[in-house]
């Protein structure tokens, strides 16, 4: 499909001249950021961004690639080097430590320097590093964590926890030896390490004693509480704050977000991770966009400002399953949340960053025609005389041999939300990829986001922009961060 | 491998504070660019950049990812949307039209708007679009094209040619019907469309009549001249300029580049594409770095400045072969050329851009240990109990079934320069990928390179920065572009 207007050079020349005009008008703000928002697309490498752009565009009856994601509108871009201290290709724990605490750690550890060793409890103490969220709280800001995964998952945990094992969600996941050495599960740290004003996502089961039925799935005890210490962490958290509210469904969330008596809000909408957007029961579970809006309504009451972490956490899960449909629809919802946040905040006082913790071995090739489905087939046949999809994975569970050969695929099969794209190597879970990811920035001090940087730079930019430790002498005026 | 110094949070905090300091010091230059250099890594997507960084670092006995490519040091980064008007995933012809002429075209066409149709000669006339190089020449600058492919290849041809078929290298490749309609081969256009001061790369055979033996391979007639029109285009080109020199080997190139009587230089060092860097005979063929240096020596004599196109064109070829070793060693040589150019020019008056025309379905995953070979195996085994490499392709010629199964691989096999990484889908040639590519910028007006842009924006930034058409009223002072 060739759009007629695009045949004319004037179309492109005018468009580029407008883009140049916009570029020339860009003026770095010299003010501090009152508010900080970091949007984290878990596993959202550049190939995911592009494919999601095309899909989002096509959902609006456009050809696709010429459209804009909300993140595409952010004026500043950098590339972020995601390796962990011990691995070329990192996990979401070590990377969370980097972009939330400003220090690189080791694979599968969270909130700890690289002096800590995976799974070795006795290497925890003394190696804790402090997140920007924690520093923002100390500076009097309100803080929040919003995610589509469990709130105890690696990425959000980087904002509040310190653990040598990212899988220690509840005490049932922590070996007795580690518990005896004083290592706490992540759910316990969520309510005890610091005061978080808004906590929204999944992860109910880690908060309640084993045998506590889940309110949404009371007959499924694999979804019920998992704790072995008998603690009801939600009850403990509620007891800490007079204006605290706990909600577990969408209706309660929307009510609580509009209730001026609510000062602290915990919403846990699934026992584990929240459902994929395509599977979400919109009567029971809020979308990431709705959670983001609820968080902003509460946090923005604080005249000193806020810090908010928003994660599209299941982009990653879709890719691990080699189900690009899931990964890309999650990315679109993530982008919708970015768009909504943009409508509810001002770039005059809010530094917004969008980035990924790492990428995936996900590619988009095969010379498809413009306007063709992102989930469709490449033109022509492969060397084995079979069709192939434009989306493919380097490794993952999509590898199948049928009668000793690669299976054929039809357009209707490849368009299914359940379809697993093929891969070169068969793995139970497709792996992360190690290439640089993009950082998109808008708002005060966004111009500092430039070039190729270590992933740690992200945390430092946020801290500097809001004059938080160790940049309290930031020399940014007016100090929009302290307007009370 | 965990470097001891990286275990200390101070290491990361200091490093990030320095990076912040550098970011704060960045001052957009308000001057025009006297000189323009565009470095084009053909097929150099972000995954290629990262993998090449690690390889280059390891060649210097470092662990890899913590090191810097020359392009990493460029202060400004943007993302470029590479789709062509008719395809989600483009080729090097349509993309060259975009970044060199500022207008998007159709797949496999060059220097033509999208009103032109692939292979339809009669859609050429009236749809030509003019490159920034051509405009620079008209403004009195010297201009040059340097590539490791044949100089008539799609990417360099975007600087000077207009053709509905990128494969029309010599008249022997153009159907008689098209020739009768007046469509010229690319080699003819190279010497006749505009005055190019420096032309360095491969592509000898397209310049000479069929039956002309090649000077380097006189006994191999498949390497000799291909032209059917009896023309010796080199002779014709030499006749146009009093100070013109033609060279075909490294020794002659180095001599010519230092000869003040040489005003125009054409160096064609192979009959077709130049050899991969790993196969190059360094006594006969210059490296891309050496060609870049030679070009800069000649072009920088012009007080009005210059435009230079430098292409690492065989990065793409390595990927098409699914031979990552070739692609990455080509990328390193490309980066070495960028580094050398940086030493020979000043960012006070030279806008340098580094970008790719498109990416490849090339991925780097599998959680390898830091410091392990980029060509090595992932830790653990795949689901089929066989080893697998960290580098893989979505599609390509690396797909092999051995006794109805995926072949096993050893570290020594995967480290071979000839090894083809496995792919999900068997193709004769691995395909391009459609995700956004990076644009790195340094020098006057480099700050305009920001955010997510159409690929066409690159040409417009160059034109604006040097006050070329259509931006002659650029309002940039001092007009460093006209210092004579």
């Amino acid at each position: 499909i060739i759009p007629v207007e695009e045949e004319n050079p004037d179309f492109w020349n005018r468009q580029a001249a407008e883009a140049l005009g916009a570029a020339k008008k860009l003026q770095p703000a010299q003010t501090a950021a009152k508010n900080l928002i970091i949007f984290l697309g878990d596993g959202m490498g550049v190939s995911t961004v592009t494919a999601a752009r095309i899909l989002k565009g096509q959902k609006k009856d456009k050809l696709g690639p010429e459209t804009f994601l909300a993140m595409d509108r952010f004026p500043y871009v950098a590339l972020s080097k995601t390796y962990s201290v011990d691995k070329h290709v990192p996990d979401s724990g070590a990377t969370a430590t980097a972009y939330l605490c400003g220090v690189k750690g080791n694979f599968q550890t969270i909130g700890l320097s690289a002096a800590a060793r995976f799974n070795q409890c006795n290497t925890t103490r003394g190696n804790e590093v402090i997140s920007v969220m924690n520093r923002a709280k100390k500076a009097g800001k309100s803080v929040g964590v919003v995610t589509t995964t469990r709130v105890q998952h690696a990425s959000p945990a980087g904002a509040y926890a310190h653990t040598v094992n990212r899988n220690w969600y509840s005490d049932a996941d922590v070996p007795a030896s580690a518990r005896q050495e004083g290592c706490q599960d992540i759910a316990t740290q969520l309510i005890s390490n610091m005061d978080i004003d808004v906590i929204l996502g999944g992860g109910r089961k880690y908060m309640f004693p084993m045998g506590t039925p889940d309110p949404e799935y009371p007959d499924d005890y694999s979804q019920g509480g998992t704790r072995l210490d008998g603690k009801n962490l939600v009850q403990e958290w509620l007891a800490k704050h007079q204006g605290a509210r706990y909600v577990w469904n969408r209706t309660e969330l929307l009510q609580a977000s509009l209730d001026p008596s609510v000062t602290h809000l915990m919403g846990l909408f699934e026992p584990g991770d929240m459902k994929y957007e395509i599977h979400r029961d919109s009567t029971l579970d809020p979308s990431l966009m709705e959670m983001t809006e609820a968080a902003l309504l509460l946090l923005s009451r604080n005249p000193r400002g806020f810090f908010l972490f928003v994660e599209g956490g299941r982009i990653d899960h879709g890719h691990h399953e080699s189900r690009a449909y899931r990964a890309l629809t999650e990315t679109i919802m993530f982008d919708d949340a970015i768009e909504r946040a943009g409508q509810l905040t001002s770039e005059e006082d809010t530094l917004s960053l969008v980035t990924a913790d790492h990428s995936h071995v996900f590619s988009f090739g095969g010379y498809p025609l413009r306007g063709s489905s992102i989930f469709g087939l490449a033109p022509g046949k492969a060397r084995d005389r079979k069709a192939y999809t434009v989306l493919l994975y380097g490794n993952g569970p999509g590898y199948v041999l049928k009668d000793g050969a690669r299976p054929d695929v039809t357009e209707s099969e490849s368009g299914s939300p359940e379809y697993r794209q093929q891969s070169a190597v068969p793995l139970d879970g497709e792996t992360h990829a190690g290439e640089d990811v993009a950082v998109f920035a808008r708002g005060p001090q966004a111009h500092l986001v430039h070039g190729v940087q270590e992933q740690t730079f992200i945390a430092h930019v946020m801290a500097f922009a809001a004059c938080l430790e160790p940049y309290t002498a930031c020399d940014l005026a007016p100090r929009a961060g302290t307007t009370d | 491998i965990i470097p001891v110094e990286e275990e200390n949070p101070d290491f990361w905090n200091r490093q990030a504070a320095e990076a912040l300091g550098a970011a704060k010091k960045l001052q957009p230059a308000q001057t025009a660019a006297k000189n323009l250099i565009i470095f084009l890594g053909d097929g150099m997507g972000v995954s290629t950049v990262t993998a090449a960084r690690i390889l280059k670092g390891q060649k210097k006995d470092k662990l890899g990812p913590e090191t810097f490519l020359a392009m990493d040091r460029f202060p400004y980064v943007a993302l470029s949307k590479t789709y062509s008007v008719d395809k989600h995933v483009p080729d090097s012809g349509a993309t060259a039209t975009a970044y060199l002429c500022g207008v998007k075209g159709n797949f496999q066409t060059i220097g033509l708007s999208a009103a032109a149709r692939f292979n339809q000669c009669n859609t050429t006339r009236g749809n030509e679009v003019i490159s920034v190089m051509n405009r620079a020449k008209k403004a009195g600058k010297s201009v040059g094209v340097v590539t490791t492919t044949r100089v008539q290849h799609a990417s360099p041809a975007g600087a000077y040619a207009h053709t509905v078929n990128r494969n029309w290298y010599s008249d022997a490749d153009v159907p008689a019907s098209a020739r009768q309609e007046g469509c010229q081969d690319i080699a003819t256009q190279l010497i006749s469309n505009m005055d190019i001061d420096v032309i360095l790369g491969g592509g000898r055979k397209y310049m000479f009549p069929m039956g002309t033996p090649d000077p380097e391979y006189p006994d191999d007639y498949s390497q000799g001249g291909t032209r059917l029109d009896g023309k010796n285009l080199v002779q014709e080109w030499l006749a146009k300029h009093q100070g013109a020199r033609y060279v075909w080997n490294r020794t002659e190139l180095l001599q010519a580049s230092l000869d003040p009587s040489v005003t125009h230089l054409m160096g064609l060092f192979e009959p077709g594409d130049m050899k991969y860097e790993i196969h190059r005979d360094s006594t006969l063929d210059p490296s891309l770095m050496e060609m870049t240096e030679a070009a800069l020596l000649l072009l920088s004599r012009n007080p009005r400045g210059f435009f230079l196109f430098v292409e690492g064109g065989r990065i793409d070829h390595g990927h098409h072969e699914s031979r990552a070793y070739r692609a990455l060693t080509e990328t390193i040589m490309f980066d070495d050329a960028i580094e050398r150019a940086g030493q020979l020019t000043s960012e006070e008056d030279t806008l340098s851009l580094v970008t790719a025309d498109h990416s490849h379905v090339f991925s780097f995953g599998g959680y390898p240990l830091r410091g392990s070979s980029i060509f090595g195996l992932a830790p653990g085994k795949a689901r089929d109990r066989k080893a697998y490499t960290v580098l893989l392709y979505g599609n390509g010629p690396g797909y092999v079934l051995k006794d109805g199964a995926r072949p096993d691989v050893t570290e020594s096999e995967s480290g071979s320069p000839e090894y083809r990484q496995q792919s999900a889908v068997p193709l004769d040639g691995e395909t391009h990928a459609g995700e956004d590519v990076a644009v790195f910028a340094r020098g006057p007006q480099a700050h305009l390179v920001h955010g997510v842009q159409e690929q066409t924006f690159i040409a417009h930034v160059m034109a604006f920065a040097a006050c070329l058409e259509p931006y002659t009223a650029c309002d940039l002072a001092p007009r460093a572009g006209t210092t004579d």
Epitope: W168, A172, P175, M210, G211, T212, S222, Q223, G230 | -
Partner: antibody, heavy 120, light 111 residues
Framework: QQQLEESGGDLVQPGASLTLTCTAS?????????MCWGRQAPGKGLEWIGC???????TYYANWAKGRFTISKTSSTTVTLQMTSLTAADTATYFC?????????????WGPGTLVTVSS | IVMTQTPSSKSVPVGDTVTINCQAS????????LAWYQQKPGQSPKLLIY???ILDSGVPSRFKGSGSGTQFTLTISDVVCDDAATYYC????????????FGGGTELVVK
């Protein structure tokens, strides 16, 4: 069909050691399962020995069993019970059992049992 | 934790209702970690009820569990011949040592 089977039961001398193996078929243990061992002396009631929680390989034992009995996960489908310093009082049918997913105190899948006889 | 079952044996006619009691020496974990098992001679135990009142899949609704904390009851209504077996309660105190224990068992004879 999901099944458990114990193996390794034998006639041994007092003071000897013995390792019993519990093998799953039709499923593999996930992190929400507790794998437990119990025993039943001839004509007597059931006695709990201990469990292993698959999520973190934590083990929990009855007071009387601690030190002499060790439960280990050896693969995603096998669990072992190592017993040392056996006495006649340890003569029993030994059962392995899998918990309801997420509920460590309820065992809904049992093996048929294997007989251990300690006698000189 | 010590689980005490009463009675140790019970004889009931077909169609009657029978109640078996189980007392824990201290509160079970979360006040609900109590399970009931049925064992027939020469067979492995079979789970009937867990978390004090939840019927395991495939168990007839004639079986009912109740109670909380330290006092629990198993009620079998409309007893049938096939219900003849020994019934055990099992309590879980937590991840402390000696975390679980079975009761002594109640033998049910159906007349």
């Amino acid at each position: 069909q999901q099944q458990l089977e114990e193996s390794g039961g034998d006639l041994v001398q007092p003071g000897a050691s013995l390792t019993l193996t519990c093998t799953a078929s039709g499923f593999s243990f996930n992190s929400n399962y507790w794998m437990c061992w119990g025993r039943q002396a001839p004509g007597k009631g059931l006695e709990w020995i201990g469990c292993i929680l698959f999520g973190n390989t934590d083990t929990y034992y009855a007071n009387w069993a601690k030190g002499r009995f060790t439960i280990s996960k050896t693969s995603s489908t096998t669990v072992t019970l190592q017993m040392t310093s056996l006495t006649a009082a340890d003569t029993a049918t030994y059962f392995c059992a899998r918990s309801v997913s997420g509920v460590g105190s309820a065992w809904n899948l049992w093996g048929p049992g294997t007989l251990v006889t300690v006698s000189s | 934790i010590v689980m005490t079952q009463t009675p140790s044996s019970k004889s009931v006619p077909v169609g009657d209702t029978v109640t078996i009691n189980c007392q824990a020496s201290e509160s079970v974990y979360n006040n609900n970690h109590l399970a009931w098992y049925q064992q027939k001679p020469g067979q492995s135990p079979k789970l009937l009820i867990y978390l004090a009142s939840i019927l395991d899949s495939g168990v007839p609704s004639r079986f009912k569990g109740s109670g909380s904390g330290t006092q629990f009851t198993l009620t079998i209504s409309d007893v049938v011949c096939d219900d003849a077996a020994t019934y055990y309660c099992a309590g879980y105190k937590g991840i402390t040592i000696d975390g679980s224990a079975f009761g002594g068992g109640t033998e049910l004879v159906v007349k």
